[in-house]
Interface confidence: low
């Protein structure tokens, strides 16, 4: 019988008392085969973190800063359940750390040096860790002790809880730096009052502070937010203008064998029985013998954290960067205009080989980072382990939802002004063998399908989106008798046709022979009835253009396209017989690396782009023997996006809508995780 006990960690006598009450009340409402609570008492949160890591306890609720500590080795804990606040109808699991200024003050985020600052308190998330972490690399050397560097950066401050004797400038705006509400400038409201009174020029608070302190919109309109891109926005636009998005209070558990499903089952049942306004006898979100015992008193309930989320992703790139700067004394970017090397994310072995060759040829401008799947790469770009990669439109959508931005587009047509003219896109097509003459778009049920990969544009999002509109359910593995759609569940019929060996079977990378455009076409040639690819795939792999044994004798005339009206046409008539127009692949990065990625890639393509005529003796960025490694092999250049610089603008309304409709069929654990942070 599996042990269904969750050992909760308590950090004080009062918490231990509440924990025992929690345990006893859960026993009274949950059947004996359900989850139960046991209580473990430790002296501090850090002791609880260590106890969970050592398997002496299972769960504890932590503030954001401690979630970061819990995540660090050797603890390796992960967030599993989030408290939410506000109403059930609009539950808030995060708050936004913001920099508030007066409307007429005229400076930006990059002009804070010499200004007067108001902080909620030394060492607090929104008031200190985040702003100072983000400003860390602008602080004057030496940066240690940190308080001295901050004192020398601003012309005066109020940082409650600082040592006024050693660092008097930090207490200049609030003599004594009192660490309680006796100091009128202490805490969120105090820091805002410090700005309002004219003592300071900027207040570092959370997004709700200004609304809690100024009920009148006309009064709020006298203030603005400083954004990280050195612009300002109105105070109600905090979702698009904040320093970091910070989780409020989170239950953590072990990453491996952490009982996360059991913890959720326990807390979900607990909130049903003892949540807000549920029971008089015991209340989960109330602390008669103290404040915020086990859970915050202001919490309204729990939400399950998506399993794909580790602490870094949960906390978010901005917050992790801020904390790491303070803890490790490292700067995330060079403080000059010079760009650091771009860390390119390479998928599996084949891409890594090409990337390493690129890195050597770039003389230090490009470095390589490996991952096994596209989603793993996107996650690494999000958390700063990598910087950029080129993605199919389906993954541009996921990357965009995860906060990344497109920076350059692959162009596939030769033109005089390639780099200045991003193309409208390519065509997604359905290819069949000419010999299967009875096959049409209308009778694909029960046939064998070949896809580039789950989540990709031509191979999945477009054909499956069209199919979904016909069948109105997500069970595509029942619609086709079998197929190869790399990235599907391994036991799915959509992995049955795949050719990868062992663990590589159906993997969404080049270790699976039927992955990508060429792989999906090969799947059709060898096993399938229909392949969902791009309009250039057939000509690129027939007529001797692909020398691989499976392709060298293929003839374009032996294949036809399925049209949506139920007819078929020759391959060259793709313009009148396609499923949809697909956005070109694009390079994505984090917003903070956008300028450098743009600059370095444009230099790189001038050196190694399609102007290189002999690829046998020289490195060619856009060549890999039809394997589409790092970039599509038919890329002519990487083009500027001009104003199409967000994922919505780049992909276009129609495609975003199509992928949005397919969201309910999404198998993307990353998309699930990213929409938790920003729905």
């Amino acid at each position: 019988v599996p042990d269904k006990t969750v050992r909760w960690c308590a950090v004080s006598e009062h918490e231990a008392t509440k924990c025992q009450s929690f345990r006893d009340h859960m026993k009274s409402v949950i059947p004996s085969d359900g989850p139960s609570v046991a209580c473990v008492k430790k002296a501090s949160y850090l002791d609880c973190i260590r106890a969970i890591a050592a398997n002496e306890a299972d769960a504890v609720t932590l503030d954001a800063g401690l979630v970061y500590d819990a995540y660090l080795a050797p603890n390796n804990l992960k967030p599993v359940v989030a408290e939410f606040y506000g109403s059930k109808e609009d539950p808030q699991t995060f708050y936004y750390a913001v920099a508030v200024v007066k409307k007429d003050s005229g400076f930006q985020m990059n002009q804070l040096r010499g200004k007067k600052s108001c902080h909620t308190g030394l060492g607090r998330s929104a008031g200190w860790n985040i702003p100072i972490g983000l400003l860390y690399c602008d602080l004057p050397e030496p940066r240690k002790p940190l308080e001295k560097a901050v004192a020398n950066f601003f012309s005066g401050s109020c940082a409650p809880c600082a040592d006024g004797t050693d660092f008097p400038q930090l207490c200049q705006l609030c003599p004594g730096c009192g660490c309680s509400t006796l100091n009128q400038y202490f805490g969120y409201s105090g820091a805002f009052k410090c700005l309002k009174d004219g003592a300071g020029d900027v207040a570092f608070v959370k997004h709700s502070t200004i609304f809690e302190n100024l009920a009148n919109k006309a009064d709020r309109d006298q203030y603005e937010l400083l954004c990280l891109d050195n612009t300002r926005k109105p105070v109600d636009e905090y979702k698009d203008c904040h320093l970091a998005q910070v989780p409020s209070h989170t239950v953590v558990a072990r990453s491996m064998g952490g009982k996360e499903d059991l913890i959720w089952e326990l807390l979900n049942q607990a909130q049903e029985h003892f949540g807000k306004d549920k029971s008089k006898e015991f209340q989960l979100f109330s602390s008669p013998h103290g404040k915020d015992l086990l859970f915050k008193d202001s919490a309204h309930g729990f939400l399950k954290v998506p399993p794909r989320m580790d602490a870094k992703m949960y906390l978010g790139y901005e917050y992790v960067t801020a904390i790491r700067n303070l803890r490790e004394g490292t700067c995330p970017e060079a403080p000059t205009d010079e760009c650091k090397p771009v860390k390119w994310c390479a998928l599996s072995h084949h891409e890594r080989l090409k990337c390493d060759e690129w890195s050597v040829n770039s003389v230090g401008k490009i470095e390589c980072v490996s991952a096994e799947t596209t989603e793993d790469c996107i996650a690494k770009i999000m958390n700063g382990e990598a910087d950029a990669m080129s993605l199919d439109g389906g993954f541009v959508y996921i990357a965009g939802k995860c906060g990344l931005v497109p920076v350059l587009a692959e162009n596939y047509n030769k033109s005089d002004n390639c780099e200045d003219t991003p193309e409208a896109g390519y065509f997604a097509i359905a290819v069949v063998k000419k010999s299967a003459s009875d096959l049409t778009w209308d009778n694909l049920k029960g046939k064998k399908s070949c896809h580039t990969a789950v989540g990709r544009t031509a191979g999945w999002n477009i054909p499956m989106g069209l199919l979904y509109n016909k069948i109105n359910h997500c069970r595509f593995d029942e619609f086709f008798s079998e197929g190869c759609a790399p990235g599907s569940k391994k036991d799915s019929s959509l992995c049955k046709l795949c050719m990868g060996s062992g663990l590589n079977l159906c993997e969404p990378n080049n270790k699976e022979g039927y992955y990508g455009y060429t792989g999906a076409f090969r799947c059709l040639v060898e096993k399938g009835d229909v392949a969902f690819v791009k309009h250039q795939t057939v000509p690129q792999n027939t007529g001797g253009k692909n020398p691989d044994p499976w392709a060298k004798n293929l003839n374009e005339k032996d294949y036809e396209l399925l049209c949506l009206d139920g007819t078929r046409k020759p391959v060259e008539e793709y313009a009148n017989c396609h499923l949809a127009r697909a956005p070109n692949h694009a390079v994505v990065t984090r917003k903070d690396k956008e300028a450098c990625v743009h600059k370095i890639l444009r230099q790189q393509q001038h050196l190694f782009g399609s102007n290189v005529t002999d690829c046998s003796g020289n490195f060619c960025l856009f060549r890999s023997e039809t394997k589409d490694l790092l970039f599509r092999d038919d890329t002519v250049c990487l083009a500027k996006l001009h104003d199409r610089n967000t994922y919505e603008k780049y992909l276009g309304e129609e495609y975003v809508k199509a992928v949005g409709n397919l969201r309910k069929c999404s198998t993307s654990s990353l998309l699930e995780a990213c929409t938790f942070r920003r729905p």
Epitope: K489, G660, T675
Partner: nanobody
Framework: QVKLEESGGGLVQAGGSLRLSCEAS????????MGWFRQAPGKERELVAG???????NYADSVKGRFTISRDNAQNTMYLQMNSLRPEDTAAYSC??????????????????WGQGTQVTVSS
């Protein structure tokens, strides 16, 4: 958890109109899309219309031009305005909500929620 409650069904003459409502409660924050399904006796359940939180919609061919789906996010309510009703529209209509981390290929319904259903009968 998400709870869904339908209302508005009933008996109506062919050519008449009805408006169905579906009110969501609970963790409504997690909802990515909602839909109306129907099942006539002896037939498979079919999607009538669907709407995402962003407002994009899709309809079954048989109801296009006659039915309109809409959503009031502030009230956590979805509506189905049914005009020019036909006898073949007679069925039990159910409201469906899918959360943002739902539905793997092959169909895990762990985060898919259904209402109890409301009967619509169209007499000729």
């Amino acid at each position: 958890q998400v709870k869904l409650e339908e209302s508005g069904g009933g008996l109506v003459q062919a050519g008449g109109s009805l408006r169905l409502s579906c009110e969501a409660s609970g963790n409504v924050f997690t909802i990515a899309a909602m839909g109306w399904f129907r099942q006539a006796p002896g037939k498979e359940r079919e999607l009538v219309a669907g709407i995402t939180t962003g407002g994009s919609t899709n309809y079954a061919d048989s109801v296009k031009g006659r039915f309109t789906i809409s959503r009031d996010n502030a009230q956590n309510t979805m509506y189905l305005q049914m005009n020019s009703l036909r006898p073949e529209d007679t069925a039990a209509y159910s409201c469906n909500a899918v959360t943002k981390w739902a539905a793997r290929v092959g169909g895990s319904a762990e985060y898919e929620y259904w209402g109890q259903g409301t009967q619509v009968t169209v007499s000729s």
